[in-house]
Amino acid sequence: GTDSGSEVLPDSFPSAPAEPLPYFLQEPQDAYIVKNKPVELRCRAFPATQIYFKCNGEWVSQNDHVTQEGLDEATGLRVREVQIEVSRQQVEELFGLEDYWCQCVAWSSAGTTKSRRAYVRIAYLRKNFDQEPLGKEVPLDHEVLLQCRPPEGVPVAEVEWLKNEDVIDPTQDTNFLLTIDHNLIIRQARLSDTANYTCVAKNIVAKRRSTTATVIVYVNGGWSSWAEWSPCSNRCGRGWQKRTRTCTNPAPLNGGAFCEGQAFQKTACTTICPVDGAWTEWSKWSACSTECAHWRSRECMAPPPQNGGRDCSGTLLDSKNCTDGLCMQNKKTLSDPNSHLLEASGDAALY
């Protein structure tokens, strides 16, 4: 055969694709030291031949690193993981104003990549509130502002408000409002908002309660309508009459003010006196009639009854026999136009 089929080797082989810079799958997160418990900071990166922590600009001793290697399940790539512990003492030993911080540095053949800085702070929550809510008495339907400035803390304390030990949720009761500076606003105070209110501040270290503020929602009293005037005290002439009202519209509640003004009014009254009727004198006797009787009359006019006075009692007419019974009885007939007068006078007699 010939050499024509033989291959000529190149001066250099094409290189494998360049390894990329390390990429952080997990960067160290800010952490808080609670009491004396150290915190763990962790990094994961690929591709990475080495990962080390640097804290406050100083490399952390290799002995303080715990390193692991493994496969990332999602990508199948080889991943390097490293973690360190930071103690309370280390953080306290850092002098100056800057917080204690750590970051990871990862190497690959392509170079290095730095992670974000993670800050490590000692967590605390001071005991005393900067401002505690004050109890107050407020009128019904008015606005209430309860102020609370929680104790200084790291991390900053979250605040919630309790109403008689139940957490207030403004999404459930829109009459309540919480503000960014931790104030509680009651939009329109209802009687049911009379309660003990407590501001609670909490973070990962502790939970603190403010002094309890008692809110009393009161109702000032209001007068009812006046009742009708009573009858005049005297049936006749000058007297008094009165009317009353009550402090029940509404009645005072929760220490609200009693109604101002009078519950009772009195006024003079004059009732025109009734005049009872009285008889005039009897008239003279009439001449003796064919019926052998004579009459006399009187009127209820001395005076007549006035202003509801009583009528006269007794008869208007009086009659008596004028011939000692010697008249003939048959002269009286039923057709006699005056016969009804005799019938009307109950004490007249016929003979």
Partner: antibody
Amino acid sequence: EVQLVESGGGLVQPGGSLRLSCAASGFNLYYSSIHWVRQAPGKGLEWVASIYSYSSYTSYADSVKGRFTISADTSKNTAYLQMNSLRAEDTAVYYCARGYAMDYWGQGTLVTVSS
Amino acid sequence: DIQMTQSPSSLSASVGDRVTITCRASQSVSSAVAWYQQKPGKAPKLLIYSASSLYSGVPSRFSGSRSGTDFTLTISSLQPEDFATYYCQQHYGLITFGQGTKVEIK
């Protein structure tokens, strides 16, 4: 019936002062927050300052801080806005309103800052 | 300060239309949002408080809702008297208003 009535507006030169009043009736101003809100001609609403007398609480917009002072005389049931070092950009109708959700407003008073 | 970004700045609609106005808060404002209606030369009027509570005397065609930091005012069926400018307002932090939405007749 709840009512708010503003007064005290007018024409003032730049650098001058003005005091606005907000007379309240139908409710006790001592137990309610009062807010001043302004509206420049043809513009939107801008919050200026707030007071809650019972808690001696006041707050101001950055644009007026140090120049304006909000106060209240609860015996007169009236809130005030003292405006000093006035600027042309303070020209607006000034409203007072009651409550954080401002359920009642006055009719407004016009403040014109011009030379 | 907390910003309230209101959109749209204006809209044209007809009587009977459903109208939606949105406000986005630059950070959490809880439910401390109110909506107002203002007509030319008049003071604003409260429509909605606490994001979704209808103020007394306001017609039920007005409603408010919240989704996170997004707040919506809806007019279910626009009436002739509803043509006006609408503002949102937050009072969770220092009070701020949206820029306003002018609802005009189409």
